[in-house]
């Protein structure tokens, strides 16, 4: 039998199934134990759980078998809608040992929420029992086969099926996706909807209008050849209960990136500039690397610039290999798998001073035994602009006698270029060395100056200057 | 679409504090530096305060210490918070989206290359 | 404080005629070419016309155009249209400073 939703309440109105007699008052129990018996009468003088004396194989065989009585085997209704179904037994007094009507789905038992009732109708012969079962408002999750289930004289016996069938509007369990495609290239969109009712059919729809005409068995692929714009896809999903829309998916066409919105620059050296950017839109398509263009701001310089490439992530750059003191225009771009963006706008900016790269010349060490102190003399080295201003110069003394050894550095002053150290040690060795310190730091130490203070007034040294290099050009 | 709308504006009396907000749609606030710039009326344009996408912030002299820009990545807004209001702050108040920025951060400052985008304005009226 | 100064302050003109606007800094832009141009008409927001000194903002007609560097700056309509008139501004940023200064207006209104 199928009972159609219109059919419902005639479900409970009907004569109850068996011999029940005319106004007879049933005894009801909300289901909520597996266990529910009906109270003590005449002819059932055992209580609930309690077990009646056993019968013999033989009289077990002269039972009369016992079924549930035959009921609604599909009901059809729509969602939201309330829906109410039973099972009955009749038991007669021969059986001794009866449990409570257990109400199943889909194989599994119904426990705690579900609202059934089970109710009692003793008479002389026995116990009818029916078990009621109801659902407010019923979703799609409630469809399925229901069943009863009872255990007499350890028998387990099963309820026909009573299937619950819930149409409604078709229900998407696939919905398109956005996605990002290359401009003028093929790609699919998915759409899959259910219901029941069956079959479900779908309509594609681009930007408000319909793509087939005619619609198309779910699922449905939907092959786009190629878009020149961005797009708003939908699908329709129509049953004989009516139409459901699936979200709209917006397929973007990739383009290239945007440039980068910002440009930090976040420390400098005397050689290197370290940049951090932050990446414009990305043009729908994940961007691969990025390119530091660097060129000499200097309006007199040939203006060829230095691309330095790196990955797009981390967004940091170290710019190396720069002059010192020199001022640099610095453009950032970002590339996706369609092209590069345009470059960043130029920004400033300066490599700190470097240290200088020649150390002092002509280098003389005279001893003046009459003051106990070396004389050391030198010439300013050619320091070219990019190494900074000149500040001072370090003079590293060494001193080297049979047992000791001493390590000592003085600085002085851009202003001379000559110091005296006083002697440290006699009968030893003293090895000068000078460098020149600009802000960006100490430049080379010159070649080693030795000279020997003797235990007396003897004085020996060699040599004690360092000859000027060849190519002093600043 | 991509916009910029300004709100919490009103009548304020001197001395009062009041909190603009500026909600920002089709793009995001954490990639992108954001403006405040202001206008009394009759007036030309004022510059008051700018926010880095990473939040490193800057304001006008005038500024410093009475209005905080700050914002909610989260939810894509833009705040300036304005304390110890003047009758002088009287004045249409246009948040506005930064098309460059270069930011200097070992000497604490930033340049702004353009404003690309502004909002509508909301009015700021100080007066008791 | 750094200043942006422009001229004319109020400028008197007829559709199809060709109108300059000067915008004086009193310090080098920033990168001697960090200045934007800005219309705005009233009750409106100011939109973006020129960044670059001379870069066309998008959307933005080819009557339009800006030339200068360092610290002199103009903006040329070739042709007034109606929708043009309106009030024009000049803004820059400069080295050391976070200060995005505004020209103080010009103001183009039919003759």
């Known amino acids: 039998e199928k009972w159609e939703e219109t059919e419902l309440d005639q479900l409970f109105s009907g004569p109850l199934p068996g011999r029940l007699p005319v106004n007879h008052r049933p005894f009801s129990a909300p289901h909520s134990s597996r266990d529910q018996l009906p109270p003590p009468q005449t002819g059932r003088s055992h209580p609930a759980h309690t077990a009646a004396p056993q019968v013999t194989s033989t009289a077990s065989k002269l039972l009369p078998p016992v079924a549930f009585n035959h009921t609604i085997g599909h009901i059809v209704l729509s969602e939201h809608k309330n829906v109410k179904f039973n099972c009955s037994i009749n038991i007669p007094n021969t059986y001794q040992e009866t449990a409570g009507i257990s109400w199943w789905k889909d194989g599994k038992e119904l426990l705690g929420a579900h609202h059934s009732i089970t109710q009692f109708y003793p008479d002389e012969e026995g116990v009818s029992i029916i078990a009621l079962f109801s659902i407010a408002s019923v979703q799609r999750s409630d469809n399925g086969s229901y069943f009863c289930k009872m255990k007499v004289n350890n028998r387990e016996i099963v309820s026909d099926p009573i299937y619950v069938e819930v149409q409604g509007l078709p229900y998407f369990i696939k919905q398109p996706e956005s996605v990002n495609v290359t401009r003028n290239t093929a790609f699919n969109l998915t759409c899959q909807a259910v219901g029941p009712p069956e079959p479900v059919n779908i309509f594609w729809v681009q930007n408000s209008s319909r793509v087939n005409e005619k619609p198309e068995r779910s699922p449905s692929v939907l092959t786009v050849p190629g878009l020149t714009e961005t797009a708003v896809f939908s699908c329709e999903a129509h049953n004989d209960k009516g139409l459901t829309v699936s979200k709209g998916v917006h397929i973007n066409i990739k383009v290239i990136p945007s440039p980068p919105t910002e440009v930090h620059i976040l420390n400098s050296t005397a050689h290197s500039i370290l940049v951090s950017w932050v990446p414009g839109f990305d043009g729908y398509s994940p961007l691969q690397n990025c390119s530091i263009q660097v060129k000499e701001a200097d309006r007199l310089s040939n203006g060829s610039v230095m691309v330095f490439n790196t990955s797009a992530s981390p967004h940091l750059y170290e710019i190396q290999q720069l002059q010192a003191l020199a001022n640099y225009s610095i453009a950032v771009s970002c590339r996706n798998e369609i092209g590069w963006s345009a470059v960043s706008p130029w920004i400033l900016a300066s490599t700190t001073e470097g240290a200088p790269s020649v150390a002092p010349l002509n280098i003389t060490v005279f001893l003046n035994e009459s003051n106990n102190i070396l004389d050391i003399r030198w010439t300013k080295p050619p320091i070219k602009r990019q190494d900074g201003e000149l500040v001072g110069y370090r003079i590293s003394h060494v001193w080297e006698s049979a047992g000791t050894y001493k390590e000592l550095s003085e600085e002085v002053s851009q202003n001379g270029s000559w110091a005296q150290i006083p002697v440290q040690i006699h009968n030893a060795t003293c090895t000068v060395r000078i460098a020149a310190i600009t802000k960006g730091g100490i430049g080379p130490f010159s070649e080693p100056v030795n000279i020997i203070i003797p235990e007396h007034s003897k004085v020996d040294y060699a040599p004690s200057s360092t000859p000027a290099p060849g190519n002093t050009d600043s | 679409e991509v916009q910029l709308v300004e709100s919490g504006g009103g009548l304020i009396q001197p001395g009062g504090s009041l909190r603009l907000s500026c909600a920002a749609s089709?793009?995001?606030?954490?990639?992108?530096?954001m403006s405040w710039v202001r206008q009394a009326p009759g007036k030309g344009l004022e510059w008051v305060s700018i926010?880095?996408?990473?939040?490193?912030?800057y304001s006008a002299s005038w500024a410093k210490g009475r209005f905080t820009i700050s914002k909610d990545n989260s939810k894509n807004t833009l705040y300036l918070q304005m304390n110890s209001l003047r009758a002088e702050d009287t004045a249409v108040y246009y948040c506005?989206?930064?098309?460059?920025?270069?930011?200097?951060?070992?000497?604490?400052?930033?340049?702004?290359?353009?404003?690309?985008?502004w909002g509508q304005g909301t009015l700021v009226t100080v007066s008791s | 404080d750094i200043q942006l100064t422009q001229s004319p302050s109020t400028l008197s003109a007829s559709v199809g005629d060709r109108v300059t606007i000067t915008c004086q800094s009193s310090?080098?832009?920033?990168?001697?070419?960090?200045l934007s141009w800005y219309q705005q008409k009233p009750g409106k927001p100011p939109k973006l016309l020129i960044y670059d000194a001379s870069d066309l903002a998008s959307g933005v007609p080819s009557r339009f155009s800006g030339s200068g560097s360092g610290t002199e700056f103009t903006l040329t309509i070739s042709s007034l249209q109606p929708d043009d008139f309106a009030t024009y501004y000049c803004a820059g940023g400069y080295s050391g400073d976070s200060d995005y200064a505004f020209g103080g207006g010009t103001k183009v209104e039919i003759k």
């Open positions: 506005a989206r930064v098309g460059f920025f270069v930011g200097y951060g070992a000497y604490d400052y930033g340049i702004i290359h353009r404003l690309d985008l």
């Open positions: 310090k080098s832009i920033y990168n001697n070419n960090w």
């Open positions: 926010i880095s996408s990473s939040g490193s912030t």
């Open positions: 089709g793009f995001s606030l954490s990639s992108n530096a």
